[in-house]
């Protein structure tokens, strides 16, 4: 059966300078694969969060995903601030070279509400 | 720079036991999976176990299950491997090995020989 | 279990390709260790199939496709002479494997 991305909340919200966690757990590890997150779709999504390396300011993830059976692959977003408004995925790749999107999350907007 | 030293190794009778250390430096230690590797004389590499970065999750090689455990304290950057009931068959050169992402292995250390030996 | 050819040859300067089998696409990752003296630390020089640590030579590269990865030493030099041992790990199982090495001679 072929691997799903779950993000279970459509949308959060949060307020200027507050954190924020947006949710995703997978039903499989396989095929083997980096997951990523995205603001937004398409040619002009931005990478907000690789799990594949650690310098992310802001971002870190929720749980301990070197745990080799780890399926949960949420991210905190600390500091929020206007300009991380927007909808969120949760992508998973099967590796190649390049890797190749095999799976995306329904997606989570943020709304960030005036402190 | 990423540095890994292991130490603890020496030579014990069979059925006795040892602790190996491996003191890291130049990483943020608690944000990665490690594990311990062994050489013996004249063969080639052998995985024996994995942690990951909180030490929650353990991982290990059928041969050690049971007798060896591995474990790290991150408020001291340092990994360990308990191995008890010691063979002859546990005669190597043991190294820790700092884990990619994706489980395999981007640094080594130096290794430390472990002869048992009666 | 990962196999790998006992031994290759090459002259300096050409084209050295070392092939480990025994791995399956969908849930294996596979890296490439060098070990230039028996029991001196091995040094990865490919991990992630592909991926080469920032401080080893851009001569050393990898691919993986099917059940097999490849190491390949573009315009081999003496000092690259050594065992290379091709690494798996298996998202199935959670456990890493190695090929038995390669002897790389430098003629």
């Known amino acids: 059966t072929e691997v799903k991305v779950i993000q279970p909340e459509k949308s959060v919200s949060v307020a200027a300078g507050d954190s924020t966690v947006l949710n995703c757990t997978l039903t499989s590890l396989l095929p083997v694969g980096p997951i990523r997150w995205y603001r937004g779709v398409g040619q002009s999504r931005q990478l907000i969060y690789s799990f594949t390396t650690e310098h992310f300011p802001r971002v870190t993830n929720v749980s301990d995903a070197t745990k080799r059976s780890n399926l949960d692959f949420s991210i905190r977003i600390s500091n929020v601030t206007p300009e991380d408004a927007g909808t969120y995925y949760c992508v998973k790749f099967q590796r190649g070279s390049p890797d190749t999107e095999i799976q995306s999350g329904g997606g989570t907007e943020v709304y960030v509400l005036a402190k | 720079d990423v540095q890994l030293v292991e130490s603890g190794g020496g030579v014990v009778r069979p059925g006795e036991s040892l602790r190996l250390s491996c003191a890291a430096s130049g990483f943020t230690f608690s944000s990665y999976a490690m594990s311990w590797v062994r050489q013996a004389p004249g063969k080639g590499l052998e995985w024996l176990a994995g942690i990951s970065a909180g030490g929650s999750d353990t991982y290990y090689i059928d041969s050690v299950k049971g007798r060896f455990t591995i474990s790290r304290d991150n408020s001291k950057n340092s990994l360990y491997l308990q191995m008890n009931s010691l063979t002859a068959e546990d005669t190597a050169v043991y190294y820790c090995?700092?884990?990619?992402?994706?489980?395999?292995?981007?640094?080594w250390g130096l290794g430390t020989l472990v002869t048992v030996s009666s | 279990a990962l196999t790998q050819p006992a031994s290759v040859s090459a002259n300096p300067g050409e084209t050295v390709k070392i092939t480990c089998s025994g791995g399956d696409y969908y849930s294996t990752y596979y890296g490439w260790y060098q070990q230039k003296s028996p029991g001196s630390a091995p040094v990865t020089v490919i991990h992630s199939d592909d991926k080469r640590p920032s401080d080893i030579p851009s001569r050393f590269s990898g691919s993986a496709s099917g059940s097999a990865a490849t190491l390949t030493i573009t315009g081999v030099r003496v000092e690259d002479e050594a065992v290379y041992f091709c690494?798996?790990?298996?998202?199935?199982?959670?456990?890493?494997?190695f090929g038995a090495g390669t002897t790389l001679t430098v003629l």
């Open positions: 690494g798996a790990y298996d998202g199935r199982t959670y456990i890493n494997t």
């Open positions: 090995a700092r884990e990619t992402w994706n489980h395999l292995f981007d640094y």
